[in-house]
C-alpha cells in the first residue's frame, strides 16, 4: 500500500531509503505501471538545487550508459521493472534519486517517480 507521503504514481522507485556501505552495489527498482509502445526511461540524480543529472537511460530496447559506467540500468524479464544500480558505491553517491519515463508520440507524456534517498556509509 502507498504511504501518505508516497502517493500512487504510474512510476515507482524503491526502496524509498537505501543504505549501503561504500564499495557495495546500490540497487533501486524503477517500475512502470503500464508499458507504452515507445518510451525513454531515464535515471536521475537530483542536486540540492533541484538540478538533474541523467545517470543512465533505457531507450527502445537499448541501454544508453551515462557519463559514468558505474551507473547501470537492467530491464527485468517482466518488462515493467528496471534495476538501476550503482556499482561500487562511493560516499559522494549519497543523495536523492528518481526515474523518469518519457512516453513518446502519439501519446506524449512525462511521468516521474517519487524520490528515493541513498546513504552510502563508510566501510566499518
Amino acid at each position: 500500500l502507498d504511504s501518505p507521503d508516497r502517493p500512487w504514481s504510474p512510476l515507482t522507485f524503491s526502496p524509498a531509503q537505501l543504505t549501503v556501505q561504500e564499495g557495495e552495489n546500490a540497487t533501486f527498482t524503477c517500475s512502470l505501471a503500464d508499458i507504452p509502445d515507445s518510451f525513454v526511461l531515464n535515471w536521475y540524480r537530483l542536486s540540492p538545487r533541484n538540478q538533474t543529472d541523467k545517470l543512465a537511460a533505457f531507450q527502445e530496447d537499448r541501454i544508453e550508459p551515462g557519463r559514468d559506467r558505474r551507473f547501470r540500468v537492467t530491464r527485468l524479464p517482466n518488462g515493467r521493472d528496471f534495476h538501476m544500480s550503482i556499482v561500487a558505491a562511493r560516499l559522494n553517491d549519497s543523495g536523492i534519486y528518481l526515474c523518469g519515463a518519457i512516453y513518446l508520440p502519439p501519446n506524449t507524456q512525462i511521468n516521474e517517480s517519487p524520490r528515493a534517498e541513498l546513504s552510502v556509509t563508510e566501510r566499518t
Epitope: V40, N42, Y44, L46, R49, N50, Q51, T52, D53, K54, L55, A57, Q59, R62, E64, P65, G66, R67, L98, G100, I102, P105, T108, Q109, I110, N111, E112
Partner: antibody
Framework: EVQLVESGGDLVKPGGSLRLSCVAS????????MNWVRQAPGKGPQWVAY????????NYVDAVKGRFTISRDNAKNTLYLQMNSLRAEDTAVYYC???????????????WGQGTLVTVSS | SYVLTQLPSKSVTLNQPAHITCGGD??????VHWYQQKLGQAPVLIIY???IRPTGIPERFSGATSGNTATLTISGALAEDEADYYC???????????FGEGTQLTVL
C-alpha cells in the same frame, strides 16, 4: 493536426514595443509548457523564454530579462510575448514552441510554429 | 552558462556517411536533441533523447551521446540533407534551453 501560428511581427524603431501572439490548435494547450525561440539573420536559434502550463513559472535568457514578458491565456489557447525597449539586436524571426514537461524531468520542443519576423531599425 | 560547441561547416560526398559532433561539459548527463533547418524554414526535430528518431524521419539519421560529445550520423548523405544542424540541451542550473551554434552540411 497540431498547429502553432505566430503573429505580431513588424518593423519597429529602437526603444519601441511589440506584442507577439501564438495561437495553438490540435493539442491540449493547457498541458504544455510553451517557449519562445528566436533566430537572428544568419545565426542559429536562441531560446528566449518559457512559461509553465499554469502560467506561474517563467524564465528568460539574460539578454531580454526586464524587457520581455511571456504570458499565456489557456482559455484562448494563446501564448504572448510582450517586447519593450527593443534593440537592434532583437531583430530576428520569433518562433513559439511547445514542450511537455514533468516536475524535474524536462522534455523536448516538439512542435514549432513557422515564425514571425521582428525588425528593429531606425 | 552551459556551452555547446559545433564545427561551423562540414562537407560530405553523396551517399557517404556524415558525422556531426556537438561538444559540451558532461553532455552525457543530459538529453540531447538535434534539429535540421533548411533555408527559410523552421527547425525540424530529427533526433531526440540522444538517439530516437521522431515519426517520419528517415532511418539514415541516428544519434549517440557519450562523455563530452554527442554525435549525429547520417549513414548515407543525400542532396536533400544539405542543411544546418543544431544540437540542443536543457541547462538545469540556468533553467534554459541551450542550442549549439550549428553545423552547415554540404553534400558534394
Amino acid at each position: 493536426e497540431v498547429q502553432l501560428v505566430e503573429s505580431g511581427g513588424d518593423l519597429v524603431k529602437p526603444g519601441g514595443s511589440l506584442r507577439l501572439s501564438c495561437v495553438a490548435s490540435g493539442f491540449t494547450f493547457s498541458r504544455y509548457y510553451m517557449n519562445w525561440v528566436r533566430q537572428a539573420p544568419g545565426k542559429g536559434p536562441q531560446w528566449v523564454a518559457y512559461i509553465n502550463n499554469a502560467g506561474s513559472d517563467r524564465n528568460y535568457v539574460d539578454a531580454v530579462k526586464g524587457r520581455f514578458t511571456i504570458s499565456r491565456d489557456n482559455a484562448k489557447n494563446t501564448l504572448y510575448l510582450q517586447m519593450n525597449s527593443l534593440r537592434a539586436e532583437d531583430t530576428a524571426v520569433y518562433y513559439c514552441a511547445s514542450e511537455i514537461r514533468g516536475v524535474v524531468v524536462v522534455g523536448h520542443l516538439d512542435y514549432w510554429g513557422q515564425g514571425t519576423l521582428v525588425t528593429v531599425s531606425s | 552558462s552551459y556551452v555547446l560547441t559545433q564545427l561551423p561547416s562540414k562537407s560530405v560526398t553523396l551517399n557517404q556517411p556524415a558525422h556531426i559532433t556537438c561538444g559540451g561539459d558532461n553532455i552525457g548527463s543530459k538529453s540531447v536533441h538535434w534539429y535540421q533547418q533548411k533555408l527559410g524554414q523552421a527547425p525540424v526535430l530529427i533526433i531526440y533523447y540522444d538517439s530516437i528518431r521522431p515519426t517520419g524521419i528517415p532511418e539514415r539519421f541516428s544519434g549517440a551521446t557519450s562523455g563530452n560529445t554527442a554525435t549525429l550520423t547520417i549513414s548515407g548523405a543525400l542532396a536533400e540533407d544539405e542543411a544546418d544542424y543544431y544540437c540542443q540541451v536543457w541547462d538545469s542550473s540556468a533553467k534554459a534551453w541551450v542550442f549549439g551554434e550549428g553545423t552547415q552540411l554540404t553534400v558534394l
